[in-house]
């Protein structure tokens, strides 16, 4: 009679985490008499998974009734999978002994592989506004994922970005691995509604890859242009001025008009217009009467933009002869007046 | 913002079991990020014990392999530490954290925990 | 596992002094190596990542740099509130492994 073989059919299987393993094993006679072992790995360090006669193993069911008589068919389930089980898988049969059972054959053995899906990259960017022109890193990571090969790309609004780090922890042997990596984005006064899209290639996700994002409009501080104008009488002792606030981001925007150095009024920008590329215009006028004022008058529209330090932008106020038109309305709201006698 | 806070007895008797969890506010422990377990000896000794993954796969440092479980429970946002067979050895501040890459941006404020009988 | 050795164990420094701590791995680890700052009864605070590279709302007087085996902290102009233990971690191979810290003290 030919000599029992053990047969593990499968070189390798593949498992994705929390899944089920199926590792396959057939004996080729029912003699000798003797249980079957699997164990995780070779030589005196291996590691038992199961063992037909005695032990008590929560996550392995048989496929078959090993108490059958006639049974031939050793194969193993492993519930739960975790990438911690990977590794190579032997089923030995043992002949029976005394006093204790000796090792007759092992099958060739099965590598179990294990897949873990990458969590959702999460994006984030710097901690403080920067403005156009400025250099900013965002920063990408997902986790939990094996095996350890992984590709990530960065995108600004669909384009592919090329100054990038990209660190995968660790290096070295692990059940799961991180993957970490800052970009560099240069800002331009057009980012208000741009995006930066790290985007994660793994072979869990069947050529679907995950992406975050990072809205640019969260990261952006586009400084205002101002603009100071004289518009035309709108009786003989009075003058309009206007000061057009125009390109800013975010709205959050403060106004003080100034009366030859003194503060004349203060208001917030609420009702802005907003420009197609995200950015605000927004514009305040003071009415002055000039009827009774024998010197010129330094108006000045100073402007408090997100926090940052005051921008200013001056008119004179030529109050000697008959005021004339020395420019033209061109924003679109006259969102805040004030009338002023100077005497 | 993320914060993390450890909570469990403070004296456990020499051969029996220390169980603490870490309550997670801030952040989905199921969205991402590892959630680690490291303890602190007197005489500046940090030592990292084993971490779980956002969607459960756990890690442990080999020195404690046998004696070491991380679970967690993301509809409580907590994760657990259980660790089987003290002795006075294991008395240590243990730290839950959240781990970026390789290392742990975001600290719990630590739980003191004595072995003695 | 990777052994992590730092030095000096104490170092006693004056407001305003530019200060050197030393961080040595027992095998090549790239640049994976982490910097953290705990103060008495605080827990750690990550200072650096990946040898150089900084930690938003981190004090730019902290600096470090390196890679292999042999890695720096550097802290520009010490002020009061640096005092404490300053580790660093290997983040290379795992077990993660942290040095035994040096000791931060204001004369």
């Known amino acids: 009679e030919e000599e029992l073989q053990v047969i593990q059919p499968d070189k390798s299987v593949l498992v994705a985490a929390g899944e089920t393993a199926t590792l396959r094993c057939t004996a080729t006679s029912l003699i000798p008499v003797g249980p079957i072992q699997w164990f995780r790995g070779a030589g005196p360090g291996r590691e038992l998974i199961y063992n037909q006669k005695e032990g008590h193993f929560p996550r392995v069911t048989t496929v078959s009734d090993l108490t059958k008589r006639n049974n031939m068919d050793f194969s193993i389930r492993i519930g739960n999978i975790t990438p911690a089980d990977a590794g190579t898988y032997y089923c030995v049969k043992f002949r029976k002994g005394s006093p204790d059972d000796v090792e007759f054959k092992s099958g060739a053995g099965t590598e179990l592989s294990v897949r873990a899906k990458p969590s959702a990259p999460v994006v984030s960017g710097p901690a403080a506004r920067a403005t156009p022109q400025h250099t900013v890193s965002f920063t990408c990571e997902s986790h939990g994922f094996s095996p350890r090969d992984i590709t990530l790309k960065w995108f600004k609004n669909g384009n592919e970005l090329s100054d990038f780090q990209t660190n995968v922890d660790p290096v070295g042997e692990s059940v799961s691995y991180s993957i970490h990596s800052t970009a560099k984005v240069v800002l331009t006064r057009e980012d208000v509604h741009s995006q930066v899209i790290c985007e994660v290639a793994h072979v869990t996700l069947q050529g679907d890859p995950l992406r975050g994002t990072a809205n640019l409009s969260e990261t952006i501080r586009v400084p205002p242009t101002l603009e100071v104008t004289q518009q035309p009488v709108r009786a003989e002792n009075q003058v309009n001025v206007t000061c057009q606030v125009r390109k800013f981001y975010p709205q959050r925007l403060q106004l003080t008009w100034l009366e030859n150095g003194n503060v004349s009024r203060t208001e917030t920008a609420s009702t802005v217009t907003e420009n197609k590329d995200g950015t605000y215009n927004w514009m305040s006028w003071l009415l002055v009467n000039v009827s009774a004022h024998r010197d010129d008058v330094k108006l000045t529209c100073q402007v408090e933009h997100d926090g940052q330090p005051a921008v200013s932008k001056s008119h004179d106020l030529k109050v000697s002869a008959h005021p004339k038109e020395q420019g033209s309305n061109t924003a679109a709201e006259n969102t805040g007046s004030n009338e002023r006698n100077i005497y | 913002d993320v914060q993390l806070q450890e909570s469990g007895p403070g004296l456990v008797k020499p051969s029996q079991s220390l169980s603490l969890t870490c309550t997670v506010t801030?952040?989905?422990?199921?969205?991402?990020?590892?959630w680690h377990w490291i303890r602190h000896f007197p005489g500046n000794i940090l030592e990292w014990m084993g971490y779980?993954?956002?969607?459960?796969?756990?890690n442990y440092n080999p020195s404690l392999k046998s004696r070491i479980s991380i679970t967690h429970d993301t509809s409580k946002n907590h994760f657990f530490l259980r660790l089987n067979s003290v002795t006075a050895e294991d008395t240590a501040t243990y730290y839950c954290?959240?781990?970026?890459?390789?290392?742990?941006?975001?600290w719990g404020q630590g739980t003191l925990v004595t072995v003695s009988a | 596992d990777i052994v992590m050795t730092q030095s000096p164990a104490t170092l006693s420094v004056t407001p305003g002094d530019r200060v050197s701590l030393s961080c040595r791995a027992s095998?090549?680890?790239?640049?994976?190596l982490h910097w953290y700052h705990q103060k008495s009864h605080e827990s750690p605070r990550l200072l650096i990542k990946?040898?150089?590279q900084s930690i938003s709302g981190i004090p730019s007087r902290f600096s470090a740099g390196g890679s292999g085996s042999d890695f720096t902290l550097t802290i520009n102009s010490v002020e009061p509130e640096d005092v404490g233990v300053y580790y660093c971690?290997?983040?290379?191979?795992?077990?993660?492994?942290f040095g035994g810290g040096t000791k931060l003290e204001i004369k």
């Open positions: 801030g952040f989905s422990i199921s969205r991402g990020y590892d």
């Open positions: 990946y040898a150089s």
């Open positions: 095998q090549s680890i790239s640049d994976s």
């Open positions: 954290a959240r781990g970026g890459g390789a290392w742990f941006t975001y």
């Open positions: 779980i993954t956002y969607s459960g796969i756990s």
């Open positions: 971690q290997n983040g290379h191979s795992l077990p993660w492994t």
